[in-house]
């Protein structure tokens, strides 16, 4: 079941999925001046069996000005620098992607990929939040949102991360720890 909505936006924070549940789709979007190859996939799909998950289909982009198809290659370093996603690019890794059964890793970039990735998440997907540069977490604890099915409708849980400006004074006891910790995360609540 696809999640109806995008994960919540919260002030001064960005989110990232550390692994993608089977059923997740990633649109094959190309950067300006490029388009999907004819008969190319519309999206990549995370699929798998009990032991292994991977992305089906390959995204391929070609110049809008030519009819030649481009081959699937890893971008050069300068291309990778330019690329960003809807979620943050961050070294934060609260879970080992490879160790989660039924999940795919972040797909590698494809040549002339759009600067923003558009994912279609499924129920049970978890995303992690982190404060943007210049802000810090007001508390120590998990900072995540999970797509859940409740009353026959999908919804994302409310992230518990509050990001405060460095200049702001707050009653924060002790040193900050990384907020995207996998342990002690809010557990599932009863849905109807």
């Amino acid at each position: 079941e696809l999640c109806d909505d995008d994960p919540p936006e919260i002030p001064h924070a960005t989110f990232k999925a550390m692994a993608y549940k089977e059923g997740t789709m990633l649109n094959c979007e190309c950067k300006r001046g490029f388009r999907r190859i004819k008969s190319g996939s519309l999206y990549m799909l995370c699929t798998g069996n009990s032991s292994h998950s991977s992305w089906d289909n390959q995204c391929q982009c070609t110049s809008s000005a030519t009819r030649n198809t481009t081959k699937q290659v890893t971008p050069q370093p300068e291309e990778q620098k330019e690329r960003k996603t809807t979620e943050m690019q961050s070294p934060m890794q609260p879970v080992d992607q490879a160790s989660l059964p039924g999940h795919c890793r972040e797909p590698p970039p494809w040549e002339n990929e759009a600067t923003e990735r558009i994912y279609h998440f499924v129920v049970g997907q978890m995303v992690y939040y982190q404060c943007v540069q210049g802000y810090r977490a007001l508390h120590r604890g998990p900072a995540e949102s999970v797509c859940k099915m409740t009353h026959g409708k999908t919804r994302w849980t409310q992230p518990q991360l509050i990001c405060t400006g460095e200049m702001e004074t707050s009653q924060f006891p002790g040193e900050e720890k990384p907020q995207a910790s996998p342990e002690g995360r809010p557990e599932s609540e009863t849905s109807c």
Epitope: E9, I10, P11, L138, Q158, S170, P173, P186
Partner: antibody, heavy 116, light 107 residues
Framework: QVQLVQSGAEVKKPGESLKISCKGS????????IAWVRQMPGKGLEWMGI????????RYSPSFQGQVTISADKSINTAYLQWSSLRASDTAMYYC?????????WGQGTLVTVSS | DIVMTQSPSTLSASVGDRVTLTCRAS??????LAWYQQKPGKAPKLLIY???TLESGVPSRFSGSGSGTEFTLTISSLQPDDFATYYC?????????FGGGTKVEIK
């Protein structure tokens, strides 16, 4: 299911101290912010402040900073709102709610009456 | 500080009416807005968050729209259970601000 249960109504005299409580159940209390909201008789809602029981991080509305103290004891899944010296103007209904941004779950409210 | 202004303060309507409540922010607040319903002697109940996302279990006759400074809560067909006071609420990383409320009463 998620529940927030507040302590009972209180009648106090001006100058007295008071501590009211909000006990959470049905979820991991330590991992969710709890806010306190005031509603004076016949008036609207006012956000007072918020606490993260996991580490007792707090944030107060400027209007209530120094007037009240928000605390929590995660070992018994309870958040508190306290006054060291009550005034007649503190007469109101006080709600706790689970946040931090919007409030999906609310306590039933604690009516505090301060009168000489 | 951001000020949230609700209008009208009181609205008289009949069962079956389409009702629109307005909430204005003194400066842009993106979509960081929630709506609540409160009945006398009861705690508020969350209806809408993120300006337009319906909370689980809330009837689909309720809908929210708007972004920036102007927001609306619409009840497509007013039911007897809907006569109550409605509050908008802005949230950000350092405070929460409620509007003054709109009371929806029976005409």
């Amino acid at each position: 299911q998620v529940q927030l249960v507040q302590s009972g109504a209180e009648v106090k005299k001006p100058g007295e101290s008071l501590k009211i409580s909000c006990k959470g159940s049905g979820y991991s209390f330590s991992n969710y912010w709890i806010a306190w909201v005031r509603q004076m008789p016949g008036k609207g809602l006012e956000w007072m402040g918020i606490i993260y029981p996991g580490d007792s991080a707090t944030r107060y509305s400027p209007s209530f900073q120094g007037q009240v103290t928000i605390s929590a004891d995660k070992s018994i899944n309870t958040a508190y709102l306290q006054w060291s010296s009550l005034r007649a103007s503190d007469t109101a209904m006080y709600y706790c709610a689970r946040g931090p941004y919007y409030f999906e779950y609310w306590g039933q409210g604690t009516l505090v009456t301060v009168s000489s | 500080d951001i000020v949230m202004t609700q209008s009208p303060s009181t609205l008289s309507a009949s069962v079956g009416d389409r009702v629109t409540l307005t909430c204005r922010a003194s400066q842009s607040i993106s979509s960081y807005l929630a709506w609540y319903q409160q009945k006398p002697g009861k705690a508020p109940k969350l209806l809408i968050y993120k300006a337009s996302t319906l909370e689980s279990g809330v009837p689909s006759r309720f809908s929210g729209s708007g972004s920036g400074t102007e927001f609306t809560l619409t009840i497509s067909s007013l039911q007897p259970d809907d006569f109550a006071t409605y509050y908008c609420q802005h949230y950000n990383s350092y405070s929460v601000t409620f509007g003054g409320g709109t009371k929806v009463e029976i005409k």
